[in-house]
């Protein structure tokens, strides 16, 4: 057992039929000595008295807020959450496996630039008595400071039969030189709490392996005369780090159609213009990689070819 | 410990290429690594990430964009004495700065080479044959320290009399080619930036 | 199978034009660009121009623009290649081909010979 | 229009053998460059498209390689079947122009 936090308790539990559970004493948090009282959440069931209270937590109905009381007062409240294990690993109800970029990936992060700001996000199918909580470092032997915000939920879809909610965070390396070369990866560590059931999930990487440009800004179309061509023009992303000289982005430019199985374009140049063949009905897009360090390629930015 | 804006006039930059090929050279040794050595330990994740010119160089940092020196948090203070003369400098009114960064970065690549070679000569003992360092990747940073044109005292290749492990030697070529990978990207930021300037 | 099969081989005389089909199968024809490459013999390879089915779109190397005319009939699924004032060194293997992308080739026809002599 | 040179024209190699063709274009083209394959008497194939991507059926030993103007397309372990002639094409801007060849031959 140990704490989340003032008075909530994990209990780490060995999943299987007939497991023996764990033992746990609950101290009551007051300087009385005699006559207090425990009970179990909204039931007024007296399951013990004294200042301690030892029970056997076995399944999710030992769990939940234990009170201690004294002549119908409250003194102290510690609430119980499992963390289940089952042979051996640790229970991932709580998160959906998003499968990308590899299987057992419960959270995802990106960056839009070096400044050492990303967020991470995650899915789950549930909707309510759901509350996490993210920390961060750089490195974890000697960890370095990352300031995470509180996770919100930024996203809610339908599939199938299913509604699926998409929480996401952003975090800021406390002191982060984008030049930097990176030897210890940034740690994410979310805690997540449904009804009395605890989760934990981490994610580990470096922020150049996260990069993923924001689309590029502002492209804009000249035809060439006497030609079926078009010059296509953009600039950086706003997002992007400075100076762009030192952080070099490189563009795929692409006309298609509606359908991407339509015939179609594509040049790849590291200027921010291109010579490309429009096509009626099709459209110009421009997206964004590092030159460098071959990460994401950003969004599609688009314009029809008309 | 920046780069000046006022630098070589455009065009007069013959590092640039030089990087980019050595860029292009260990991405592509690092691939061939991954694939050969896919039982091993080679990937970014499994790997210690070490940088063998800790301490003794700092590219980082005296290669810098002036831009970047108002960031409290690039500027650390580690302090080295480089040799000043190198040709990649293609004009007079290169700064001392300049000639700083340039010359980190030929110490950087000095290091490396001396590390490749040492490990290409354990790799060639092996009786399995499984994996070599590309001559290509070898030529391409020779290339790019000539361009570069720093005297230095030369490094002598380490030699050990004891039989080599040929799999630390392997999980070894893994950790100094993501290094280096990483080394070789900062040095094209550089050059690019200084081009650009 | 995506396949192009091309026209049999022609003897020109300088001067004259030579006109080369290549018909298409196994595809959608108007979802693909169709492209003429030359080859002279013991030579390279020598791009001329392509055309956009869909659209009749076309586009020519500047070696070749006001002597060359690449038609499509989507009719009969088949490209043409017209090339005029003709010469010695116009003799060469002319080959169709086809990709969903501009600008690379992904199917070849089996290739034209054409002889211009006198 | 940009000139693409390959080198060398023509290489003798064995059976077993790891070759390596060069392509350089005459100014930056990204990575827009393409290999062909072509033997005697037959239509050109699609061996890598946008200097590194692997075509499906195109055997692994096939490998390109470059961006800017400097490419490559190395052949690992040479078989019988590799025995032909292999082209570069630039697809950065129109006119596509293709290198000279280089002729892989039997030593």
């Known amino acids: 057992i140990w704490e989340l936090k003032k008075d909530v308790y994990v209990v780490e539990l060995d999943w299987y039929p007939d497991a023996p559970g764990e033992m746990v004493v609950l101290t009551c948090d007051t300087p009385e000595e005699d006559g207090i009282t425990w009970t179990l959440d909204q039931s007024s069931e007296v399951l013990g008295s004294g200042k301690t209270l030892t029970i056997q937590v076995k399944e999710f109905g030992d769990a939940g807020q234990y009170t201690c009381h004294k002549g119908g007062e409250v003194l102290s409240h510690s609430l119980l959450l499992l963390h289940k294990k089952e042979d051996g690993i640790w229970s991932t109800d709580i998160l959906k496996d998003q499968k990308e970029p590899k299987n057992k990936t419960f959270l995802r992060c990106e960056a839009k630039n070096y400044s050492g700001r990303f967020t991470c996000w995650w899915l789950t199918t549930i909707s309510t008595d759901l509350t996490f909580s993210v920390k961060s470092s750089r490195g974890s032997s000697d960890p370095q400071g990352v300031t995470c915000g509180a996770a919100t939920l930024s996203a809610e879809r339908v599939r199938g039969d299913n509604k699926e909610y998409e929480y996401s965070v952003e975090c800021q390396e406390d002191s982060a030189c984008p030049a930097a070369e990176e030897s210890l990866p940034i740690e994410v560590m979310v805690d997540a709490v449904h009804k009395l059931k605890y989760e934990n999930y981490t994610s580990s990487f470096f922020i150049r392996d996260i990069i993923k440009p924001d689309p590029p800004k502002n492209l804009q179309l000249k035809p060439l005369k006497n030609s079926r061509q078009v010059e296509v023009s953009w600039e950086y992303p706003d997002t992007w780090s400075t100076p762009h000289s030192y952080f070099s982005l490189t563009f795929c430019v692409q006309v298609q159609g509606k359908s991407k199985r339509e015939k179609k374009d594509r040049v790849f140049t590291d200027k921010t213009s291109a010579t490309v063949i429009c096509r009626k009905n099709a459209s110009i897009s421009v997206r964004a990689q590092d030159r460098y360090y071959s990460s994401s390629w950003s969004e599609w930015a688009s314009v029809p070819c008309s | 410990r920046n780069l000046p804006v006022a630098t070589p006039d455009p065009g007069m930059f013959p590092c640039l290429h030089h990087s980019q090929n050595l860029l292009r050279a260990v991405s592509n040794m690092l691939q061939k690594a991954r694939q050969t050595l896919e039982f091993y330990p080679c990937t970014s994740e499994e790997i210690d990430h070490e940088d063998i010119t800790k301490d003794k160089t700092s590219t980082v940092e005296a290669c810098l964009p002036l831009e970047l020196t108002k960031n409290e948090s690039c500027l650390n203070s580690r302090e080295t004495s480089f040799i000043t003369n190198g040709s990649c400098l293609a004009s007079r009114k290169t700064s001392f700065m300049m000639a700083l960064c340039l010359s980190s970065i030929y110490e950087d690549l000095k290091m490396y080479q001396v590390e490749f070679k040492t490990m290409n000569a354990k790799l060639l003992m092996d009786p399995k044959r499984q994996i070599f360092l590309d001559q290509n990747m070898l030529a391409v940073i020779d290339e790019l320290m000539q361009a570069l044109n720093f005297n230095s005292e030369t490094v002598p290749q380490k030699s050990s009399l004891e039989e080599p492990d040929f799999y630390k030697t392997k999980i070894k070529l893994c950790i100094l080619l993501h290094a280096f990978r990483i080394r070789a990207v900062t040095i094209d930021r550089v050059m690019s930036y200084l081009n650009a300037s | 199978e995506v396949q192009l099969v091309q026209s049999g081989a022609e003897v020109k005389k300088p001067g004259a034009t030579v006109k080369i089909s290549c018909k298409a199968s196994g595809y959608t024809f108007s979802d693909y660009y169709l492209h003429w490459v030359r080859q002279a013999p013991e030579k390279g390879l020598e791009w001329m121009g392509w055309i956009d089915p869909e659209n009749g779109d076309t586009e020519y190397a500047p070696k070749f623009q006001g002597r060359v005319t690449i038609t499509a009939d989507t009719s009969t699924d088949t490209g043409y290649l017209e090339l005029s004032s003709l010469r010695s060194e116009d003799t060469a293997v002319y080959y169709c081909?086809?990709?969903?992308?501009?600008?690379?080739?992904?199917?070849w026809g089996q290739g034209t010979l054409v002889t211009v002599s006198s | 229009d940009i000139q693409m040179t390959q080198s060398p024209s023509s290489v003798s190699a064995s059976v077993g053998d790891r070759v390596t063709i060069t392509c350089r274009a005459s100014q930056s083209i990204s990575i827009n460059l393409h290999w062909y394959q072509q033997k005697p008497g037959k239509a050109p194939k699609l061996l890598i498209y946008?200097?590194?991507q692997s075509i499906s059926g195109v055997p692994s030993r096939f490998s390109g390689y470059g961006s800017g103007t400097d490419f490559s397309l190395t052949i690992n372990s040479l078989q019988p079947e590799d025995f032909a002639t292999y082209y570069c094409?630039?697809?950065?801007?129109?006119?596509?122009?293709f290198g000279g060849g280089t002729k892989v031959e039997i030593k």
């Open positions: 946008f200097a590194s």
């Open positions: 094409q630039q697809s950065n801007s129109f006119p596509l122009t």
């Open positions: 081909a086809a990709n969903k992308e501009l600008r690379y080739f992904d199917v």
